[in-house]
């Protein structure tokens, strides 16, 4: 795995990685701001549980098909994917922040971005989330409550914003009719809608329709949630790599200097090299690294 | 439909500079990385400079450091690369292009730099 940018120049003398020659392809009640000395609960430190942490700004929404296309021992599955990919981000109101919603008819939220706990108590409620077994899940009234609810108002603009939409069933047609609308509305906001389509009754058509709105909206079918586990580490990294690292601390002016921070092009500071498992986590703000990379194959 | 557009090239004497100009559209820039690209005639094309998504952390090939600068604007999509103190050997069309996850996915046609002695 690759830790630096100067890994990217390493990559590149080794061999031409492209996909593109040139020339072809041209709601929770609002809170006071944070203050940085501010201590919250979620704030006191719990070590990472794995190898592969996500410290990044990255606002995450899950969303969870409440179907009875899922049973409830699926549905059971599908809630432990979630909280294993919770296990792997650094969730707190400076890094990662998630919000969990349940879709059937309409939308349940049982986590909103700016809830104030620690990882381990919003694992637990995630754990919790109640199976519906509706007739019904819809789609469309899920990105619409994605859109007008929980980013209605972007107040992390540096952070990245992602839809991660676990569907195993289809919407009546009836219900589809804005289906497009809602996913343009999110691109229009920088929304990253991620489907996940699990089992034979996903709804494909929407799955594509999505990933034509936007090329970084990348889908992941599954054939069943027994795929969950396999595909969990591309899809976490996938996310990942779609978020910003922190900017440093700016500097009062007469602090400032022009010479190049430890941890922009010297390997020193990056920690270790990563393998499989990549480790997004830094210890220190300050130390500036950009995500590792994957030799494309 | 995603384009990248550069502008800014032109024909320089050494010593002298050039702000080179690639404008993105069709793709949620901030989740890229950006990179500057050069290619001289029967040369394999070479990674300049790169920045990461927020723009805090840069890097250079080692002919270019010191004399290049790369920055983007992610409010206008945009990114930049200031060319310096130009030598005739920077003479090339200079590609900006879009890296996401892992892979190059996206490029510009090009803008020509010619440099004169």
């Known amino acids: 795995e690759r830790g630096s940018l100067n890994d990217i120049f390493e990559a590149q003398k080794i061999e031409w990685h492209t996909s593109q020659e040139p020339g072809g392809l041209v709601v929770p009640p609002t809170d006071a701001p944070v203050s940085p000395t501010t201590l919250y609960v979620e704030d006191i430190s719990e070590p990472p549980l794995h190898d592969f942490y996500c410290s990044r700004l990255l606002d995450l929404v899950f969303l969870l098909d409440g179907s009875s296309r899922l049973s409830e021992a699926e549905f059971e599955v599908l809630k432990a994917f979630v909280v294993d990919m919770m296990e792997r981000l650094r969730i707190s109101q400076k890094w990662v922040r998630v919000a969990v919603v349940e879709y059937h008819d309409g939308s349940h939220a049982y986590i909103g971005l700016k809830d104030r706990k620690r990882p381990s108590e919003l694992r637990r409620i995630a754990s919790q989330v109640k199976y519906a077994g509706s007739q019904v899940a819809s789609t469309s009234e899920v990105l619409k409550y994605t859109l007008f609810q929980i980013f209605s108002k972007i107040d992390r603009p540096e952070a990245s914003r992602i839809a991660l939409l676990l569907m195993a069933s289809q919407e009546p047609q009836r219900m589809s009719r804005n289906f497009v609308r809602y996913v343009q509305g999110l691109k229009k906001k920088k929304v990253i809608v991620i489907p996940v389509g699990i089992g034979p009754h996903a709804n494909l058509k929407q799955i594509r329709l999505i990933e034509k709105q936007a090329p970084e909206n990348k889908a992941f079918v599954l054939s069943s949630v027994d795929e969950l586990e396999q595909q969990r580490d591309e899809i976490v990294s996938y996310l990942c790599d779609l978020a910003p690292e922190a900017p440093p601390p700016t500097l009062p002016p007469d602090m400032a200097q022009v010479t190049v921070g430890p941890g922009l092009l010297g390997v020193s500071t990056l920690g270790p090299k990563r393998n499989h498992h990549h480790h997004h986590h830094h210890h220190h703000a300050h130390i500036v690294m950009v995500d590792a990379y994957k030799p494309t194959k | 439909q995603v384009q990248l557009v550069e502008s800014g090239g032109g024909l320089v004497q050494a010593g002298g500079s050039l702000r080179l100009s690639c404008a993105t559209s069709?793709?949620?820039?901030?989740?890229?990385?950006m990179g500057w690209f050069r290619q001289t005639p029967g040369k394999e094309r070479e990674l300049v400079a790169l920045i990461s998504l927020s723009g805090s952390s840069t890097d250079y090939a080692d002919s270019v450091k010191g004399r290049f600068a790369i920055s983007r604007d992610n409010a206008k999509d945009t990114v930049f690369l200031q060319m310096n103190t130009l030598k005739p050997e920077d003479t090339a069309v200079y590609y900006c292009a879009a890296r996401l996850g892992s892979s190059w996915k996206y490029w510009g046609q090009g803008t020509q730099v010619t440099v004169s002695s």
């Open positions: 069709g793709i949620i820039f901030s989740v890229y990385h």
